[in-house]
């Protein structure tokens, strides 16, 4: 009955502060509406990074001011988080909810540790 969610253990953000990873879920039912949430866990505190609801077969749409973008293909979601800085290094959990039709299912991934290294400032040129 439990819904399994898989995501990579570790991802290194690019020098531009962009990190991408795949969140894959094994759907126990034939969901038509799915909600995907990215959570950040730090010191046992959990906060929402971004969330999007999508209809199966349609594109994943985050709010305009979201730091996340993504695409969906079947039971797989490709997530991209932008604007990351070194202080954002942490565990990012993919949460999947099958909202419709009933029954509701919840899936929680083990989390992806995203490492962000701030780029060194360019030296002044004479």
């Amino acid at each position: 009955k439990a819904m399994h969610v898989a995501q990579p253990a570790v991802v290194l953000a690019s020098s531009r502060g962009i990190a991408s990873f795949v969140c894959e879920y094994a759907s126990p039912g034939k969901a038509t509406e799915v909600r995907v949430t990215v959570l950040r866990q730090a010191d046992s505190q959990v906060t929402e990074v971004c969330a999007a609801t999508y209809m199966m077969g349609n594109e994943l749409t985050f709010l305009d001011d979201s730091i996340c973008t993504g695409t969906s293909s079947g039971n797989q979601v490709n997530l991209t988080i932008q604007g990351l800085r070194a202080m954002d290094t942490g565990l990012y959990i993919c949460k999947v909810e099958l909202m419709y039709p009933p029954p509701y299912y919840l899936g929680i991934g083990n989390g992806t540790q995203i490492y962000v290294i701030d780029p060194e400032p360019c030296p002044d040129s004479d």
């Epitope: 009955k1 819904m3 959570l39 959990v46 929402e48 029954p103 509701y104 919840l106 929680i108």
Partner: antibody
Framework: QVQLVESGGGVVQPGRSLRLSCAAS????????MHWVRQAPGKGLEWVTF????????YYADSVKGRFTISRDNSKNTLYLQMNSLRAEDTAIYYC???????????WGQGTLVTVSS | EIVLTQSPGTLSLSPGERATLSCRAS???????LAWYQQKPGQAPRLLIY???SRATGIPDRFSGSGSGTDFTLTISRLEPEDFAVYYC?????????FGQGTKVEIK
Amino acid sequence: QVQLVESGGGVVQPGRSLRLSCAASGFTFSSYHMHWVRQAPGKGLEWVTFISYDGNHKYYADSVKGRFTISRDNSKNTLYLQMNSLRAEDTAIYYCARTGWLGPFDYWGQGTLVTVSS
Amino acid sequence: EIVLTQSPGTLSLSPGERATLSCRASQSVGSSYLAWYQQKPGQAPRLLIYGAFSRATGIPDRFSGSGSGTDFTLTISRLEPEDFAVYYCQQYGSSPWTFGQGTKVEIK
């Protein structure tokens, strides 16, 4: 701090209606799924109904399906439970509860007592 | 519907003793979706453990959870006077959300 305060309980005759409210504060109410859970006198906890963060999805226990309606007003930070065709077996303390980010019911109200009796 | 069965119904122990409470599910529950709650007379339930073994904010480390699949355990390593209460397990991985019938931990 997170606070959930239920109101609207009381004594009502079988077949009548009652509406419970749950006022939320201390968090962004519109971001969280919510539930109602009840507890009959001297008994265990029974999940009653669920509503999604945006109010678009609702689920009910078989025991209340067709009689109870859950709703929310995110502009007022308030959760509701409309109870119709009440029965003696609906007598219980009704709690509203918040779904935490990882799924458990992380905050509960103090409860409001509903007594269905003639 | 996932049915949760708790045992024993009542546990009579003395302060300082170890309490072991069991919760068995009628079908497999992912460990990410099992919680334990404590309820004292006249009070609302309080979240103790989520994800089978993670302690909720402010919960002392004498409370610990374990298990997977269909068998889960809540352990209180050394009972304090304030720990005498009723404990419920719950699964939240699928609807309908279900609770066990509770285990009462009483003073011997």
